[in-house]
Amino acid sequence: AAIIPQSSACPNTEAKDFLQNVKVNLKVFNSLGAKVSSRRPSDYLNRSTSPWTLHRNEDPDRYPSVIWEAQCRHQRCVNAEGKLDHHMNSVLIQQEILVLKREPESCPFTFRVEKMLVGVGCTCVASIVRQAA
């Protein structure tokens, strides 16, 4: 997001209250070009050996308020026969993203930046087998 100073004179970046003097332009720009998203496959969630489902995570006090999150369908992985393989585990791949959270009871609205862990897909890993001593 682009940070735009509130006044025509840019605030002093060394001032302690610098972050109180900026406003954020929430317009989302696709710098990679429009064709990028159309190449993003959406069927991996079903074709994967560790398939996942997507859930619409809504938080009206967050920007963005809608985030689609992955959840692994099974604890185990699916083998070539379509059966669950008990030697392989399905694990969630998570990505840390930055979101803006609305401060409660603030008027006009003020937001704070927060980190959020989002599930983006699942992958298959070998189960840890502990040998008996």
């Epitope: 429009a34 064709k35 998203s37 159309s38 959406s42 969630l45 997507l54 619409r56 809504e58 809608v66």
Partner: antibody, heavy 119, light 107 residues
């Protein structure tokens, strides 16, 4: 120019299923959510559910969870809404609408598809 | 589910009149409210989003205000093409819900 063009009117018998299509043009199909809303004759609007064509994710109104299925075909930039076990109360105009996920509002709507359920 | 109670359900007015429609949410929806115009046999058309922002190309006679649970939609000077049904909608949380609509008729 953004356009959402829906399939034509349908007449169905109770217990049957209907599949309504919504073809998008004028923007990148996978960038925005598609929501489905219906309007019974002389009634208000009722939200059915949402699909994100970019990731295949869906979410439904509890009232429709067991009967509605939302899908999207990226190759033809078309979203679909299938409603099963139809009853007379499902007679309505069904709309698809584009939702700007980041901005948070519905901007473009399809022209609507009238589904009549009658024996 | 969040209920959106819209009033009045119908309204008679003349060209040039100032018209106000209200919408009350059953719980706070912040500013996540839109206002739509619908003419017979047509799909809804977005006029106002985020309670008070006019959508692209919408004439300045249309305005909206409010936050929390109480919202107002105003047409400052009615034009002949404004006679239609208007409804509010919340997209604060799903299931997204709509007001029952206000039918604006010529007096």
């Amino acid at each position: 120019e953004v356009q959402l063009v829906q399939s034509g009117a349908e007449v169905k018998k109770p217990g049957a299923s209907v599949k309504v299509s919504c073809k998008a043009s004028g923007y990148t199909f996978t960038d925005y959510e598609f929501h489905w809303v219906r309007q019974a004759p002389g009634q208000g609007l009722e939200w059915i559910g949402v699909i994100h064509p970019g990731n295949g994710g869906t979410a439904y109104n509890q009232n429709f969870r067991d009967r509605a299925t939302l899908t999207a075909d990226k190759s033809t930039s078309t979203a679909y809404m299938e409603l099963s076990s139809l009853r007379s109360e499902d007679t309505a105009v069904y709309y698809c609408t584009r939702f700007l996920t980041y901005e948070g509002y519905f901007d473009y709507w399809g022209q609507g598809t009238l589904v009549t359920v009658s024996s | 589910d969040i209920q959106m109670t819209q009033s009045p359900s119908s309204l008679s007015a003349s060209v040039g009149d100032r018209v106000t429609i209200t919408c009350k949410a059953s719980q706070s929806v912040s500013i996540d409210v839109g206002w739509f115009q619908q003419k017979p046999g047509k799909s809804p058309k977005l006029l106002i989003y985020h309670a008070s922002n006019r959508y692209t190309g919408v004439p300045s006679r249309f305005s909206g205000s409010g936050s929390g649970t109480d919202f107002t939609f105003t047409i400052s000077s009615l034009q002949p093409e404004d006679f239609a049904t208007y409804f509010c909608q919340q997209d604060y949380s799903s299931p997204y819900t709509f007001g029952q609509g206000t039918k604006l008729e010529i007096k």
